[in-house]
């Protein structure tokens, strides 16, 4: 009955809920998901009962141990898992709780440009990086390449100030979640600012 274990999985992947016990005579092991029974095991009886038939193909026990492997993960597998080990040799069941977070593999992030101004030969704008499907727990960073020192910027919004005549710069957004990362298409400062080059005081979206 240890502390809650946090586990992370990816959609379509698999996760193993680690479980060990040194109890000799285990009468039954009961796994539940958000209070719904998932699997009941009777090691001595040799029976494993998966409550919902659709989960049968997703449940496995690596190396014939007590740990439960759940495969073909879906987003809605995220939640609280609980296991109880019942034995006549234990005064009360041995328990363990797990929290599973299932994340999607990130698609290519989308970049949008904010209001752009071009004053005194300097192009000023914001680039905003976002995921089209609103994926959770995404962390954004920007890479700015091309000047003497490559720079990084944390957050989804990158403020840009680029002077005409300077060497061109490339901006790439990196989106990360606990199971994957993906990159936006590279954006060139010169191309970005070309639209406002004719009118030094113009603003555009």
């Amino acid at each position: 009955s240890g502390p809650v274990k946090e586990l992370v999985g990816s959609v379509g992947g698999a996760v193993t809920f680690p479980l060990k016990s040194k109890v000799k005579q285990v009468d039954s092991i009961v796994w539940t998901f958000n209070t719904t029974p998932l699997v009941t095991i009777q090691p001595e009886g040799g029976t494993i009962i998966v409550t919902q038939n659709r989960n049968r193909e997703r449940v496995d026990f690596p190396d014939g141990g007590y740990s439960l492997k759940l495969s073909k993960l879906k987003k809605n597998d995220s939640g609280i898992y609980y296991v109880g080990i019942y034995s006549s040799s234990l005064q009360q069941p041995s328990t363990q709780e797990y929290v599973l977070h299932v994340y999607e593999h990130l698609s290519k992030p989308k970049v949008t440009m904010g209001l752009q101004s071009n004053k005194n030969g300097t192009c000023v704008t914001n680039l905003t990086c976002c995921m089209e499907h609103g994926e959770e727990d995404v962390i954004y960073t920007w890479k700015a390449l091309g000047q003497a020192a490559n720079e990084s910027h944390n957050g989804s919004i990158l403020p840009i100030s680029w002077r005409w005549g300077e060497s061109d710069m490339t901006f790439i957004c990196v989106a990360r979640n606990p199971v994957s990362r993906n990159f936006s298409s590279p954006i060139l400062a010169r191309k970005l600012c070309e639209g406002a080059a004719d009118d030094p005081d113009s603003s555009m979206v």
């Epitope: 000799k24 001595e44 040799g46 494993i48 007590y66």
Partner: antibody, heavy 120, light 108 residues
Framework: QVQLVQSGAEVKKPGASVKVSCKAS????????MNWVRQAPGQGLEWIGR????????KYNGKFKGKATLTADKSTSTAYMELSSLRSEDTAVYYC?????????????WGQGTLVTVSS | DIQMTQSPSSLSASVGDRVTITCKAS??????VAWYQQKPGKAPKLLIY???YRYTGVPSRFTGSGSGTDFTLTISSLQPEDFATYYC??????????FGGGTKVEIK
Amino acid sequence: QVQLVQSGAEVKKPGASVKVSCKASGYTFSSSWMNWVRQAPGQGLEWIGRIYPGDGDTKYNGKFKGKATLTADKSTSTAYMELSSLRSEDTAVYYCARSTMIATGAMDYWGQGTLVTVSS
Amino acid sequence: DIQMTQSPSSLSASVGDRVTITCKASQDVSTAVAWYQQKPGKAPKLLIYSASYRYTGVPSRFTGSGSGTDFTLTISSLQPEDFATYYCQQHYSTPPYTFGGGTKVEIK
């Protein structure tokens, strides 16, 4: 990795006894049942019994009560099976095999086998 | 003791064939049946436990099914390394555990 290494082949006379050893490594020896299974030449498999090394608890196939005695030494992670009053029909390959945790009657790791030949 | 009757005792098949071996228990053993593969001079190898659970590392062409008294091991597409003898075993509740007589799968 899990390994079960058994002692070498034995040739015994009828009425004698023999003790076969099975040294385990790669897992917690005291926490898994150890089974013994025999296979007479050209025949099928026959379960003899099992021992829980943690406390020495044993369960036998009724057919082998009085014939086989199972013991275990936790300090050396070794299980033993002693066969007494040997007869020619005890000629067989004897295997030790570890029980899985999830289904204690299923056996996932096996020793290489020890041939016991009983002949006058 | 629970008897396990396995059939056929031998069969001839070709690489790529679908092979089915059956095992009948003399009384209800729920889903407590294991299947093993044994090659000459070697120890048995666990394929399936609790009727349908493939042991770690066992190829997906091996499938176990059944409950109660009737059980089946299916090899979906026989490979050269699958020619061996197969045993079913009931591991229900209190021992003794008992094995079927074996099925020898030979090359046609």
